[in-house]
């Protein structure tokens, strides 16, 4: 029961152009090209997009025209391979152009860079931005798509269209406001933060599909959709999972036009069938397409249906469990996951998947045993420690967060994770630990029933960032092991890591701890990052340093920065006081 059109089209490019409309077509092609060729200048991409668009129009006019029958991968790949500087700019990626489809597209996908060497996006003055917006709105918005897409090569393309729409609305409103900055800056901050979160969530979906396969993604989707739509029956959830898997497979595979088109179809189907899906969809379904799709993706869990009987009867107490499992494994396990998830909106998706895996493993073992029923009779007892582990961890960490506040909680995690995996680059450890620390303000405010799904599923997203960054330049076998062994056990794997006793402390380098007056003009966030970078380096130099030692050094460091930033001659203060601080820190840590 798929919702997607299966009829063949003479010209795929004409089909998608007609379905999506010119504006969305051009935006999606620009995103696709920027996600593949992340270093190319904006103007080059715009030129390529315009050429593709003109070609698409000829195909709309006559689907039998020359080359109109070619696949989108062939058309887009051919276009990308016309870039003159491909070899100089991208090195071995240029070798992709010698391949045929589908290998050529796979090759481009493999060269997507999660951490491209691009300058940080600096936000110009509000008046400068508003002038640029008014001078050429279309170019201004295209530039936004381009800059986000090239920095986030797995950003969910149809969702990026939604962000661009909000970006445009912010400028349209605020550039007319009396106080432009007061109106615009909070909106841009919100879009930036939401955009980073959206990118990271999508990166996990793509990693799930690409590294662990379709079955892993479908299991995740069954659990999440069953929690979200507990009144929907299994066949409905299964259908939504199949369609959602197709959408994300397409987007993660660079098939952005198909992905956006199919996502729109799925939103349409959900809204046409909301009575059998969820009572929470009404407001979403009254919105325009981009807002509607976003709203559905974020919709709150529906209320659990009344009269759900115990699962034990069908999945533990019945003597026919093995027969049902043997004759319909996927349906039986899918039904187990669906039934368990719809009863447990208070569990994280990854926990539900661990329970389902435990159940499957138990059946595999017990159904081959002499007395299967006796063997699997206590399987639900095996769930208890699996449930308690994240509950306890969240309780402890929320207590620590409430005690320390976000910045110091991040620091505690920085120390913890640097000691676990000290080989990982300092910028990665800072970025990942800062994001891990944000779980506190994001989730600890929630009541017990919402904490685990908030916290553990968020941690899965953040740890995936660590995994994809580490995969680019692997330095730690422990990280590789936790990242590759089991998608759902990544967080417990990292939690279980102790201090790496094999690590040889880093040589002391005074330059790492030399600071200048420029730190005084940084934002609070940037200043925190500088201090946290120093903290990671300290731990790398002295992995056995105690919490107390590190706290003392960091307190001294904060006082040093505050003192020198108030000094008349800041640079001299940083030079002289800095030397003293380094010496005192070395003494305090026994370096």
């Amino acid at each position: 029961r798929g919702v997607f059109r299966r009829d063949a089209h003479k010209s795929e490019v004409a089909h998608r152009f007609k379905d999506l409309g010119e504006e969305n077509f051009k935006a999606l092609v620009l995103i696709a090209f920027a996600q593949y060729l992340q270093q190319c200048p904006f103007e080059d991409h715009v030129k390529l997009v315009n050429e593709v668009t003109e070609f698409a129009k000829t195909c709309v006019a006559d689907e039998s025209a020359e080359n109109c029958d070619k696949s989108l991968h062939t058309l887009f790949g051919d276009k990308l391979c016309t870039v003159a500087t491909l070899r100089e700019t991208y090195g071995e990626m240029a070798d992709c152009c010698a391949k045929q489809e589908p290998e050529r597209n796979e090759c481009f996908l493999q060269h997507k860079d999660d951490n491209p060497n691009l300058p940080r996006l600096v936000r110009p003055e509000v008046d400068v931005m508003c002038t640029a917006f008014h001078d050429n709105e279309e170019t201004f918005l295209k530039k936004y798509l381009y800059e986000i897409a090239r920095r986030h090569p797995y950003f969910y393309a149809p969702e990026l269209l939604f962000f661009a729409k909000r970006y445009k609305a912010a400028f349209t409103e605020c550039c007319q406001a009396a106080d432009k900055a007061a109106c615009l800056l909070p909106k841009l901050d919100e879009l930036r933060d939401e955009g980073k979160a959206s990118s990271a969530k999508q990166r996990l979906k793509c990693a799930s599909l690409q590294k662990f396969g379709e079955r892993a993604f479908k299991a995740w989707a069954v659990a999440r959709l069953s929690q979200r739509f507990p009144k929907a029956e299994f066949a409905e959830v299964s259908k939504l999972v199949t369609d959602l898997t197709k959408v994300h497979t397409e987007c993660c595979h660079g098939d952005l036009l198909e992905c956006a088109d199919d996502r729109a179809d799925l939103a349409k189907y959900i809204c046409e069938n909301q009575d059998s899906i969820s009572s929470k969809l009404k407001e979403c379904c009254e919105k325009p397409l981009l807002e509607k799709s976003h709203c559905i993706a974020e919709v709150e869990n529906d209320e659990m249906p009344a009269d759900l009987p115990s699962l034990a009867a069908d999945f533990v107490e019945s003597k026919d469990v093995c027969k049902n499992y043997a004759e319909a494994k996927d349906v039986f396990l899918g039904m187990f996951l669906y039934e368990y998830a719809r009863r447990h909106p208070d569990y994280s998706v990854v926990l539900l998947l661990r329970l389902a895996k435990t159940y499957e493993t138990t059946l595999e073992k017990c159904c081959a045993a002499a007395d299967p029923h006796e063997c699997y009779a206590k399987v639900f007892d095996e769930f208890k420690p699996l449930v308690e582990e994240p509950q306890n961890l969240i309780k402890q960490n929320c207590e620590l967060f409430e005690q320390l506040g976000e910045y110091k909680f991040q620091n505690a995690l920085l120390v913890r994770y640097t000691k676990k995996v000290p080989q990982v680059s300092t910028p990665t450890l800072v970025e990942v630990s800062r994001n891990l620390g944000k779980v506190g303000s994001k989730c600890c405010k929630h009541p017990e029933a919402k904490r685990m799904p908030c916290a553990e599923d968020y941690l899965s997203v953040v740890l995936n960032q660590l995994c994809v960054l580490h995969e680019k330049t692997p330095v730690s076998d422990r990280v590789t092991k936790c990242c590759t062994e089991s998608l759902v056990n990544r967080r417990p794997c990292f939690s279980a890591l102790e201090v790496d006793e094999t690590y040889v402390p880093k040589e002391f380098n005074a330059e790492t701890f030399t600071f200048h007056a420029d730190i005084c003009t940084l934002s609070e966030k940037e200043r925190q990052i500088k201090k946290q970078t120093a903290l990671v380096e300290l731990v790398k130099h002295k992995p056995k340093a105690t919490k107390e030692q590190l706290k003392a050094v960091m307190d001294d460091f904060a006082a040093f920065v505050e003192k020198c930033c108030k000094a008349d001659d800041k640079e001299t203060c940083f030079a002289e006081e800095g030397k003293k601080l380094v010496a005192a820190s070395q003494a305090a840590l026994g370096l």
């Epitope: 029956e233 299994f234 059998s276 009987p309 115990s310 009867a313 107490e317 019945s318 319909a328 039986f332």
Partner: antibody, heavy 120, light 108 residues
Framework: EVQLVESGGGRVQPGGSLRLSCAAS????????MNWVRQAPGKGLEWIGH???????YYATWAKGRFTISRDNSKNTLYLQMNSLRAEDTATYFC??????????????WGQGTQVTVSS | AFELTQSPSSLSASVGDRVTITCRAS??????LAWYQQKPGQPPKLLIY???DLTSGVPSRFSGSGSGTDFTLTISSLQPEDFATYYC??????????FGGGTKLTVL
């Protein structure tokens, strides 16, 4: 509206066959274990069998061999094929929906029933 | 397959009375027992499942208890619409299910 409607009942000669249908609306049959239950005039409820979400059919001991449960998901319809009918098979035949895909009970949703009379 | 013995098979009572019907299984069925009410010419209606859970929409004067082999259905204060036949059903021990013989509740 979520409902079950049985059809196909009637009068049949001993030794004859009959196929009952149960049309489901408002939900997908494939998501549930679907049951047939009968009730002879003035008597209690008697479970005949069910087909679960894995398309595996189970029967009461007395029903094995003569009765067959099947379903057509595309038509969203459940069937009960009854062969070698006897006078004691005279009853109202109900279809009922299990709580889940592999549930043998409880049955919250029932059809109104269809009457089968076996007599010469 | 297990058997369910319901008692009494018939019972007369008055409006306002407290009524108890029992159901005994030939082997343990944990808490997997349901109670139904049936009126003439109608299909059964689910009252209680998993021995003691009240189905939504069913008046709170109905309650169920028990586990293992012995179960009871109690109507705390009989109303005129409660005169009907009541059945217990055991499920979950295998992919088969069994109904009790029924209890006909009539006006005294």
């Amino acid at each position: 509206e979520v409902q079950l409607v049985e059809s196909g009942g009637g009068r049949v000669q001993p030794g004859g066959s009959l196929r009952l249908s149960c049309a489901a609306s408002g939900f997908s049959l494939s998501s549930y274990a679907m049951n047939w239950v009968r009730q002879a005039p003035g008597k209690g409820l008697e479970w005949i069998g069910h087909i679960n979400a894995g398309d595996i059919a189970y029967y009461a001991t007395w029903a094995k061999g003569r009765f067959t449960i099947s379903r057509d998901n595309s038509k969203n319809t459940l069937y009960l094929q009854m062969n070698s009918l006897r006078a004691e098979d005279t009853a109202t035949y109900f279809c009922a929906r299990g709580a889940g895909g592999f549930s043998t009970g409880p049955f919250k949703l029932w059809g109104q029933g269809t009457q089968v009379t076996v007599s010469s | 397959a297990f058997e369910l013995t319901q008692s009494p098979s018939s019972l007369s009572a008055s409006v306002g009375d407290r009524v108890t019907i029992t159901c005994r299984a030939s082997e343990s069925i944990n808490s997997r027992l349901a109670w139904y009410q049936q009126k003439p010419g109608q299909p059964p209606k689910l009252l209680i499942y998993d021995a003691s859970d009240l189905t939504s929409g069913v008046p709170s004067r109905f309650s169920g208890s028990g586990s293992g082999t012995d179960f009871t259905l109690t109507i705390s204060s009989l109303q005129p619409e409660d005169f009907a036949t009541y059945y217990c059903q055991g499920y979950g021990g295998s992919s088969t299910t069994t109904f009790g013989g029924g209890t006909k509740l009539t006006v005294l």
